[in-house]
């Protein structure tokens, strides 16, 4: 299976609410043999791999943001942990993987990744990540909402805030 | 905080099994891998083997397949390791290890020392 | 299965020395290796993760360098109470595999 990132760049200004979202995809066996643990966390671009280390998001690591359960369900994160930190991590049943965070500040710019583990009896483990850069801004040359720069060639959109 | 808690240590006869247990407290126990690792005295570290509580998804090191059994009890947050035919090459002390996917042995449980004696 | 080899089983150093341990991995891991302390008596704990990272609450003395099969794991400055033995693990590919140890004693 894969992950794909739908925007590279998210630039937000002080105050908004941004999405950020992953979508994996590829053969997916719902049998009961196979889970899929999906998380987020802060990074930063290292020499030799992208999403290398593992930051906390406001204070929440990567194990606090988790979601896991087999094939394409739907999860949430505990809404209680989220609300107190303004962030909600949730899952799709089409594969969408996203970040919610809220009330954002410039503390918040950063490299972000998604991760998926595929967690199958017998079997090493299968990873892999996305990774994306939100920057927040203020002042006078911040736009009035997100906008969000596609991963590929397209034309950037505008993006709803959350 | 996360803690792994180990039960205490087991003087075993030959031919015997012990089983070994680790509680789990301060996270989500069913979402990161249980690690069992074996120290024999004065040696290194050997995997042995884990067990992922959420699914009961399990892989082994290929040389404790039919000595090492892993099992976990989501409702009580506890991993166990069951050695069967014990002998003295199992006299170790055995450690139990979180392992959230995807990542490496981010903590441990204080080991509980087996010694195999007739 | 992936062999990691820690070349020296044993280290002399001295109190405030720059010290390097290092380990081989028999085939490409990227960079997925972590390093951990044993303290006689305890339990081994996380000191560096994805080859350069430390983990939380780490001192910053301890750092770690590498990538593909040739991992390095330097204290800057030695304290008494780093004395005591280091692993390397792979974290790579399952059966996940560590290296026999390196024990850094005084000079």
């Known amino acids: 299976f894969k992950v794909a990132t739908l925007y590279s760049l998210y630039v937000c200004p002080e105050g908004q609410n941004v999405t950020l979202t992953c979508r994996f995809f590829g053969p997916v066996d719902k049998g009961h043999d196979v889970t899929f643990y999906k998380t987020w966390y802060r990074s930063s671009r290292g020499e030799v791999q992208t999403c290398s280390e593992r930051r906390p998001i406001r204070n929440l690591t990567f194990q606090d943001l988790h979601l896991h359960h087999g094939g394409h369900q739907a999860a949430n994160t505990s809404h209680d942990l989220a609300q107190r930190h303004g962030l909600e991590s949730a899952s799709d049943h089409h594969g969408n993987f996203s970040i919610t965070m809220r009330n954002l500040t410039l503390l918040d710019s950063g490299l972000y990744c998604c991760l998926v583990v595929e967690i199958r009896h017998h079997h090493s483990e299968h990873r892999v990540h996305g990774a994306m850069e939100l920057q927040v801004q203020t002042g006078k040359d911040a736009p009035s909402s997100c906008v969000a720069y596609p991963s590929s060639s397209q034309e950037s959109e505008n993006i709803t805030a959350a | 905080q996360v803690q792994l808690q180990q039960s205490g240590a087991e003087l075993m006869k030959p031919g015997a099994s012990v089983k070994i247990s680790c509680k789990a407290t301060?996270?989500?126990?069913?979402?990161?891998?249980i690690e069992w690792v074996k120290q024999r005295p004065g040696h290194g570290l050997e995997w042995i083997g884990e067990?992922?509580?959420?699914?009961?998804?399990?892989n082994f090191n290929e040389k404790f397949k039919g000595k090492a059994t892993f099992t976990a009890d989501t409702s009580s947050n506890t991993a166990y390791l069951q050695l069967s035919s014990l002998t003295s090459d199992d006299s170790a002390v055995y450690y139990c290890?979180?392992?959230?996917?995807?990542?490496?042995?981010?903590?441990w449980g204080a080991g509980t020392t087996v010694t195999v004696s007739s | 299965d992936i062999v990691m080899t820690q070349s020296h089983k044993f280290m002399s150093t001295s109190v405030g020395d720059r010290v390097s341990i290092t380990c081989k991995a028999s085939?490409?891991?990227?960079?997925?290796v972590a390093w951990y302390q044993q303290k006689p008596g305890q339990s081994p704990k996380l000191l560096i993760y994805?080859?350069?990272y430390r983990y939380t609450g780490v001192p910053d003395r301890f750092t770690g360098s590498g990538s593909g099969t040739d991992f390095t794991f330097t204290i800057s400055s030695v304290q008494a109470e780093d004395l005591t033995v280091y692993y390397c693990?792979?974290?790579?590919?399952?059966?996940?595999?560590f290296g026999g140890g390196t024990k850094l004693e005084i000079k």
């Open positions: 693990q792979q974290h790579y590919s399952s059966p996940w595999t």
């Open positions: 301060g996270y989500t126990f069913s979402s990161s891998w």
């Open positions: 067990i992922f509580p959420g699914s009961g998804s399990l």
């Open positions: 085939q490409d891991v990227t960079t997925d």
């Open positions: 994805s080859a350069s």
């Open positions: 290890a979180r392992r959230p996917p995807g990542w490496f042995f981010d903590v």
